[in-house]
């Protein structure tokens, strides 16, 4: 179930996709890959108000229950929701090789 | 891949399953569950420092750009990796039902 | 089976403006990068810019910075090339091309789209 | 911008010998990780430009093996080791070391 996509904080302040730049070197992946030297990195970042895009019934309930013990039970935390796949061109022992990774780059985000 | 199951910040403090004792009440369920009266929530709290159950390649990216940009990045969170169903009694138009949710409880968690 | 699929020829006036389109069928379109070249009759081939559809970022060789506009729509999976202030140099094939950032690799290519520029 | 210059601009072939084409580029194109970004398409009559070599020595996949790419730094050389009838159209070197990308001038390889 995916809840409401109206962001009570204010636009751009709630779970949403953003893009990073990032080298490989900020990556650490400088010793293994090779292309792309740089990645558009795909995350979800933003606040996880009240039933705003709850990803399911257990995201309701640390909802609920981080309203009444905001000390013990944190509130739901963005994350993706689907990914994006992306191909690297990579070192191996005999040369380089491509290989696809399905769980590298967020599609799409929610709260949970 | 599943990362490092060692918590640097001492036992307990990493991402974990925990147990909150919480009533219909506290759910906001009591107009329309009628058992169980008191629900044992299994959630996964607990912080998320470099590579600690890190869920896949995004999370492990993530900690690396959190360390770089700690203000744009957020550090991984702690979220279930998978559920333990449960089943309910509820109201229905016409008396009562036994539905079962695969989403409720929290059965293992990990870092994304 | 991936493909990029570009619109049909155009042809345009001195002057005006050309907007080629570039649809990737069948396959993931946005963790590529899309790199638009041309060819003109008879010559060799000249990169004019691309873009990262993940973010929507561009970039331009400095010979068409302000002349050419490259977009894309995450939604339909396809590419755009806008090129304003048409002359008659700018009769060309355009080419997408899929590639990983601007490192080259270009494994994919879309067929071309001949622009006639012609008064 | 890397200015890329092949040579011959012309080639005829024998059917079953071999052939060379050369390719300089007029800054660098070795990376810090000991790669040099090079590229080689093959472009056939009527067609579109294909990918034969990444990375200067990278077979693409389904390129056959009598396609060879050698070289470092500026100098650069496509090789065929028994060109083939299909093997005839324009070749171009192309430097990814930087943006803008930029190719050579092509080589166009024909039957004699």
């Known amino acids: 179930a995916r809840n409401g996509d109206h962001c009570p904080l204010g636009p751009g302040r709630c779970c949403r996709l953003h893009t990073v730049r990032a080298s490989l070197e900020d990556l650490g992946w400088a010793d293994w890959v090779l292309s792309p030297r740089e990645v558009q990195v795909t995350m979800c970042i933003g606040a996880c108000p009240s039933q705003f895009r709850a990803a399911n019934m257990h995201a309701q309930i640390k909802t609920s229950l981080h309203r009444l013990k905001p000390d013990t039970v944190p509130a739901p935390c963005c994350v993706p929701a689907s990914y994006n796949p992306m191909v690297l061109i990579q070192k191996t022992d005999t040369g380089v090789s491509l290989q696809t990774y399905d769980d590298l780059l967020a599609k799409d985000c929610h709260c949970i | 891949a599943r990362n490092g199951d060692h918590c640097p910040l001492g036992p307990g403090r990493c991402c974990r399953l925990h147990t909150v004792r919480a009533s219909l009440e506290d759910l906001g369920w009591a107009d329309w569950v009628l058992s169980p009266r008191e629900v044992q929530v299994t959630m996964c709290i607990g912080a998320c420092p470099s590579q600690f159950r890190a869920a896949n390649m995004h999370a492990q990216i993530k900690t690396s750009l959190h360390r770089l940009k700690p203000d744009t990045v957020p550090a991984p969170c702690c979220v279930p990796a998978s559920y333990n169903p449960m089943v309910l009694i509820q109201k229905t138009d016409t008396g009562v039902s036994l539905q079962t949710y695969d989403d409720l409880l929290a059965k293992d968690c990990h870092c994304i | 089976q991936v493909q990029l699929v570009q619109s049909g020829a155009e042809v345009k006036k001195p002057g005006s403006s050309v907007k080629v389109s570039c649809k990737a069928s069948?396959?993931?379109?946005?963790?590529?990068?899309i790199s638009w070249v041309r060819q003109a009759p008879g010559q060799g081939l000249e990169w004019m810019g691309g873009?990262?559809?993940?973010?929507?970022?561009?970039s331009y060789a400095q010979k068409f910075q302000g002349r050419v506009t490259i977009t894309a729509d995450e939604s339909t999976s396809t590419a755009y090339m806008e090129l304003s202030s048409l002359r008659s140099e700018d009769t060309a094939v355009y080419y997408c091309?899929?590639?990983?950032?601007?490192?080259?690799?270009?494994?994919?290519w879309g067929r071309g789209t001949l622009v006639t520029v012609s008064s | 911008d890397i200015v890329m210059t092949q040579s011959p601009l012309s080639l005829p072939v024998t059917p079953g010998e071999p052939a060379s084409i050369s390719c300089r580029s007029s800054?660098?194109?070795?990376?810090?990780?000991?790669?040099?970004?090079l590229d080689w398409y093959l472009q056939k009559p009527g067609q579109s430009p294909q990918l034969l070599i990444y990375l200067g020595s990278n077979r693409a996949s389904g390129v056959p093996d009598r396609f060879s790419g050698s070289g470092s730094g500026t100098d650069f050389t496509l090789k065929i080791s028994r060109v083939e009838a299909e093997d005839v159209g324009v070749y171009y070197c192309?430097?990814?070391?930087?943006?803008?990308?930029?190719f050579g001038g092509g080589t166009k390889v024909e039957i004699k």
């Open positions: 800054q660098s194109l070795l990376y810090s990780n000991g790669y040099n970004y």
């Open positions: 069948g396959g993931t379109f946005s963790s590529y990068y």
């Open positions: 192309m430097q990814a070391i930087g943006v803008p990308l930029t």
């Open positions: 873009i990262a559809p993940i973010s929507g970022t561009a």
């Open positions: 091309a899929r590639g990983l950032a601007y490192d080259g690799y270009f494994d994919l």
